[in-house]
């Protein structure tokens, strides 16, 4: 009876999310393998988040709006492990917007989700950021490693969206 009611709840939650995400990929987790954590198909998952790489070339503001429509934000990178996971799926000759910007050009960088900007957990390429006119951040491959660079926000780039996993 308990399992039946849990399944019913799960199905109703799935139906609720179906209007936003036509397809979800779920895995069982938790100590009793009773919880399902899901990401929209074909998003990838890492720890408690889902990631989507958009190959559409758009400005930073349009890229953020695009993520927002999908219930996400441009990616906020919190750890080197997270960055290493993300970069496995990126093309080395491309650049991708991050959810990091400096709208006033005062070198006061801010994450789109209001996560405090911690200078000690940043992965800027050597010499970057280097221009107050370049107010948005990308991740790209340079000098044999992935890192961040400041660029013009209005210049179209690919982008990475991030959202919290859906738990049902």
């Amino acid at each position: 009876n308990f399992m039946y009611s849990k399944t019913v709840k799960r199905l109703s939650k799935l139906q609720e999310y179906q209007q936003y995400y036509p397809s979800l990929t779920c895995v069982m987790e938790g100590k009793d393998m009773e919880d399902w954590s899901c990401c929209p198909t074909p998003w990838t998952s890492f720890q408690s988040s889902c990631y989507f790489i958009s190959t559409v070339m758009q400005s930073w503001t349009k890229s953020q709006n695009n993520c927002s429509v999908m219930g996400a934000d441009l990616v906020v990178i919190n750890t080197k492990e997270e960055q290493d996971f993300i970069t496995q799926n990126l093309k080395i000759n491309s650049a991708y917007f991050l959810g990091l910007s400096d709208p006033k050009g005062w070198r006061h960088w801010q994450w789109v989700d209001q996560t405090p900007y911690n200078k000690n957990v940043t992965f800027w390429h050597s010499g970057e950021p280097n221009s107050p006119d370049e107010r948005c951040a990308i991740i790209n491959f340079r000098s044999e490693e992935w890192g961040w660079n400041d660029v013009h926000c209005h210049v179209p780039q690919k982008s990475i969206c991030k959202m919290k996993k859906i738990y049902i």
Epitope: Q58, S59, K62, E134, R135, H154, V155
Partner: antibody, heavy 121, light 111 residues
């Protein structure tokens, strides 16, 4: 006082080339992005090319891509537009304009007086 | 590309009256309260001159009779009261995304 002075315009035959120059003074040229904007006779404004302050980024509309090249010499406080394979529809007054960044975009806060390019056989 | 449509194409206004020009963008040029639409004035035989930046900010040295408003896709330039020296073409321009684009212009004549 900010000044932008264009030169190099003239009459050229279709298929020909011209190099426009813009001499900047009264500000730290190397700190600003610059653009060329043109205006055909009796028509509106059309952006033609942009170059970033550090020369790392150039951008063109499809109408001139592959034919026009924007460049700058920060040591000489000068902006250039190399125009090749010119067409009749490139006939216009060409303005150089300074970009001032605001939030996620920019506007053109100073313009030169313009130089006239006429493409005709 | 973002297309900017200005209206009217021309208007004639008596001195002391109000002139209103609108600019409609094919998609939003605003983001989190910042509106990346700008206005320029161009008098015959002269280069364009910046009037208003970011929808409503008056450029230094521009008379206070010029004002701008709007957000998203719809923006307005108002001249109130109009003076004889305001005879000119007026252009809007967006910069939220490359390529930067201009409206087709509005010709303002003083009756």
């Amino acid at each position: 006082e900010v000044q932008l002075v264009e030169s190099g315009g003239g009459l050229v035959k279709p298929g020909g080339s011209l190099r426009l120059s813009c001499a900047a003074s009264g500000f730290t040229f190397s700190s600003y992005g610059m653009s060329w904007v043109r205006q055909a006779p009796g028509k509106g404004l059309e952006w033609v090319a942009t170059i970033s302050s550090g020369d790392s980024y150039t951008y063109y509309p499809d109408s001139v891509k592959g034919r026009f090249t924007i460049s700058r010499d920060n040591a000489k406080n000068s902006l250039y537009l190399q125009m090749n394979s010119l067409r009749a529809e490139d006939t216009a007054v060409y303005y150089c304009a300074r970009q001032l960044y605001y939030s996620y975009g920019y506007y053109f806060d100073y313009w030169g007086q313009g130089t006239t390019v006429t493409v005709s056989s | 590309d973002i297309v900017l449509t200005q209206s009217p194409a021309s208007l004639a206004v008596s001195p002391g009256q109000r002139a209103t020009i609108t600019c409609r963008a094919s998609e939003s040029v605003s983001f989190h309260g910042t509106h990346l639409m700008h206005w320029y004035q161009q008098k015959p035989g002269q280069p364009p001159k910046l009037l208003i930046y970011a929808a409503s900010n008056l450029e230094s040295g521009v008379p206070a009779r010029f004002s701008g408003s709007g957000s998203g896709t719809d923006f307005t330039l108002t001249i109130n009261p109009v003076e004889a020296e305001d005879t000119a073409n007026y252009y809007c321009q967006q910069s939220i995304e490359d390529p930067p684009t201009f409206g087709g212009g509005t010709k303002v004549e003083i009756k």
